[in-house]
Amino acid sequence: EPHSLRYNLTVLSWDGSVQSGFLTEVHLDGQPFLRCDRQKCRAKPQGQWAEDVLGNKTWDRETRDLTGNGKDLRMTLAHIKDQKEGLHSLQEIRVCEIHEDNSTRSSQHFYYDGELFLSQNLETKEWTMPQSSRAQTLAMNVRNFLKEDAMKTKTHYHAMHADCLQELRRYLKSGVVLRRTVPPMVNVTRSEASEGNITVTCRASGFYPWNITLSWRQDGVSLSHDTQQWGDVLPDGNGTYQTWVATRICQGEEQRFTCYMEHSGNHSTHPVPSGKVLVLQSHWQ
């Protein structure tokens, strides 16, 4: 998995008038990291993990950068012609990555009302756009605006390729992010389903990185994919992830089923609690 920094900026217009507020979210290695969601942007770390990465400092630099980008995107939205009545959004997503071999990737993507209409590879400076005529019109509109003023273009790109990578490297220097492994807490619960059946659910939480194997086994053999229900692997707001898997089994056969968990080379099996014990927790070392 490469290390990545992802900026997601959103500005809105109402009946052709660009709104003063904007929303900015920054993800570090896929985790919510910073957020600005007020009329006046104030970079807020998303949880203790983000604070640890940023260190004991104010976030003036981040606030300044994010505010500047928000203003630039509002100006871009103001120049989009043919804005219909009602609510419209312009979204810009910038991503930079550092791979294990130290190679880098950077890209920028624009979305209007949630639809992608323009992308740029920030290393080759190559632009691409979808084939639809609406996307092409929007893309030409935005590219022309960005070309109008070289200085404007420069400020708009001030946190792009080089700066994005510089910020990413700065965050990685904290050591908090760098190839950290946090093992999951696994707990198994049971609930009555239909007569004679129970639903058993295995939850893994608080783990990093996000790659995990979680599955139900009967007598040591995996149940087929279609007999299990999986939850998405989702950020839990603490810089770690959570997920679950559930299946339906016959009451009285609980002892034959185990939840198998594998994460970062470690593995463990977790039995179904019997009788009235509702939760069984275990945390491998």
């Epitope: 009967q218 007598d219 040591g220 053999v221 995996s222 149940l223 087929s224 279609d226 007999t227 016959c250 056969e253 002892q255 034959r256 198998y260 594998e262 080379g265 593995h267 039995p271």
Partner: antibody
Framework: EVQLVESGGGLVQSGGSLRLSCVAS????????MNWVRQAPGKGLEWISY????????YYADSVKGRFTISRDNAKKSLYLQMNSLRDEDTAVYYC???????????????WGQGTTVTVSS | DIQMTQSPSSLSASVGDRVTITCRAS??????LNWYQQKPGKAPKLLIY???SLQSGVPSRFSGSGSGTDFTLTISSLQPEDFATYYC????????FGGGTKVDIK
């Protein structure tokens, strides 16, 4: 006594079909996951199919996928293997085997039948 | 599919010898590994499950160890009735057997 008895083997022409049966006694078949394993003359063991107790998880080895079908009838205490499009290389002794239900088991087969011989000739 | 490779494919030993058979998986299988003994014309018999747990009724001279990709079956002191073929089997991803190790009299 806990035991498994296979039947249905015999001589069949290449491209033909056979249905093997395995009858359980001494234990409640419906509680157990079951398998078919075969052994070609002078060769090692080859697992070919698995069916769990509720028949909602079924697996096949690549060598038989699409040609063989595993099924069970718990009321008749029987496990079956329908074999179609038989080939010369399917010639073997076919065993049915029970998956142990001991806590902490890892898909181990604790009870085996005596085997039934299938010979495919071209 | 996971491949199971047993070594050696055959070995000659004497009564009283300590015998070690290894089984290697093509990828990590945790402890989802079982060992069987088969004598000519007979069905296989379960010896060890979960890599190291002794099946009920099996003599304590048989032991298993290992986790991940490398596993070992050890017979501490070979007895006349132990001359047979031994197979490992994994259940981590569906099911597969190793190629077998024949133990015969030296």
């Amino acid at each position: 006594e806990v035991q498994l008895v296979e039947s249905g083997g015999g001589l069949v022409q290449s491209g033909g079909s056979l249905r093997l049966s395995c009858v359980a006694s001494g234990f409640t078949l419906s509680r157990y996951s079951m398998n078919w394993v075969r052994q070609a003359p002078g060769k090692g063991l080859e697992w070919i199919s698995y069916i769990n107790s509720r028949s909602n998880t079924i697996y096949y080895a690549d060598s038989v996928k699409g040609r063989f079908t595993i099924s069970r009838d718990n009321a008749k205490k029987s496990l079956y293997l329908q074999m179609n499009s038989l080939r010369d290389e399917d010639t073997a002794v076919y065993y049915c085997a029970r998956v142990s239900d001991i806590t902490g088991n890892t898909g181990a087969f604790d009870i085996w039948g005596q085997g039934t011989t299938v010979t495919v000739s071209s | 599919d996971i491949q199971m490779t047993q070594s050696p494919s055959s070995l000659s030993a004497s009564v009283g010898d300590r015998v070690t058979i290894t089984c290697r998986a093509s990828q990590s299988i945790s402890s989802y590994l079982n060992w069987y003994q088969q004598k000519p014309g007979k069905a296989p018999k379960l010896l060890i499950y979960a890599a190291s747990s002794l099946q009920s009724g099996v003599p304590s001279r048989f032991s298993g160890s290992g986790s991940g990709t490398d596993f070992t079956l050890t017979i501490s002191s070979l007895q006349p009735e132990d001359f047979a073929t031994y197979y490992c089997q994994q259940s981590y991803s569906t099911l597969t057997f190793g190629g077998g190790t024949k133990v015969d009299i030296k």
